[in-house]
Amino acid sequence: FERTRSLQDPCSNCPAGTFCDNNRNQICSPCPPNSFSSAGGQRTCDICRQCKGVFRTRKECSSTSNAECDCTPGFHCLGAGCSMCEQDCKQGQELTKKGCKDCCFGTFNDQKRGICRPWTNCSLDGKSVLVNGTKERDVVCGPSPADLSPGASSVTPPAPAREPGHSPQ
């Protein structure tokens, strides 16, 4: 079947990095500069991705593979294949329509991206606040108030701070 197909369609013999040139009797021609074909049998080459502005080149384009971009320092990738670059903020901030803004009281962000999230409500688990929260850190919940009453023989070791979930991209 493969042999039959190649007899019927000479383009199937054109390897990656070339295209089947209809203007030249279906000869396999190399992809022009700044273009590529990642599979054989292509009738055209694709234009290479250009990494510009806040995008920088992570991998150069070749005749057989597209360029890959990442983000310049101070930005991070969003989307498949780094289709967008989003500005970083400092820990304790989030990106708003006015740029990076400090987290409101009662919320925190321990990353350079994502949104400010509410502190854990220790009382919902019957615990008390062992370490107060900040703009950058969640509260640390400790033993319940009953465990701290006078005469209690032992103190329950504090629960570890919850691992904040990553905000959706």
Epitope: R49, C51, K52, G53, V54, F55, C69, L78, C82, S83, M84, C85, E86, Q87, L95, T96, K97, K98, G99, C100
Partner: nanobody
Framework: EVQLVESGGGLVQPGGSLRLSCAVS????????MSWARQAPGKEFEWVSS???????YYVESVKGRFTISRDNAKNSVYLQMSSLRPEDTAVYYC????????????????WGQGTLVTVSS
């Protein structure tokens, strides 16, 4: 071919003013949101300001009240009027399209100019 060409940069004393221009060609400017970003020497890129096709504007806090972004659809141009300039405003300023309409976020399909250098020094 899409082109964004910035001009108007230069040396200015602290407290002075400059007006940057960005002339655009090769796409439908009137329906495109536009933005300005800057990169200070040895520092990271920073979003500065954006303007919707409707004229609605956004600014980073550090330039609010000092910088004004505007557009002239008849001239296919976007401007950044900068006043009360400070040494920390020294940077290369870039004009770019703004397809995401999200502050501080650019898409891979956005177009960028080559930049114009603004130096604020006495």
């Amino acid at each position: 071919e899409v082109q964004l060409v910035e001009s108007g940069g230069g040396l200015v004393q602290p407290g002075g003013s400059l007006r940057l221009s960005c002339a655009v060609s090769g796409f439908t400017f009137s329906s495109s949101a536009m933005s300005w970003a800057r990169q200070a020497p040895g520092k990271e890129f920073e979003w500065v300001s954006s303007i919707y096709s409707s004229g609605k504007t956004y600014y980073v806090e550090s330039v609010k009240g000092r910088f004004t972004i505007s557009r002239d659809n008849a001239k296919n141009s976007v401007y950044l009027q900068m006043s009360s300039l400070r040494p920390e405003d020294t940077a290369v300023y870039y004009c770019a399209t703004w397809k995401t309409l999200r502050v501080g976020v650019w898409d891979e399909s956005d177009y960028w100019g080559q930049g114009t250098l603004v130096t604020v020094s006495s």
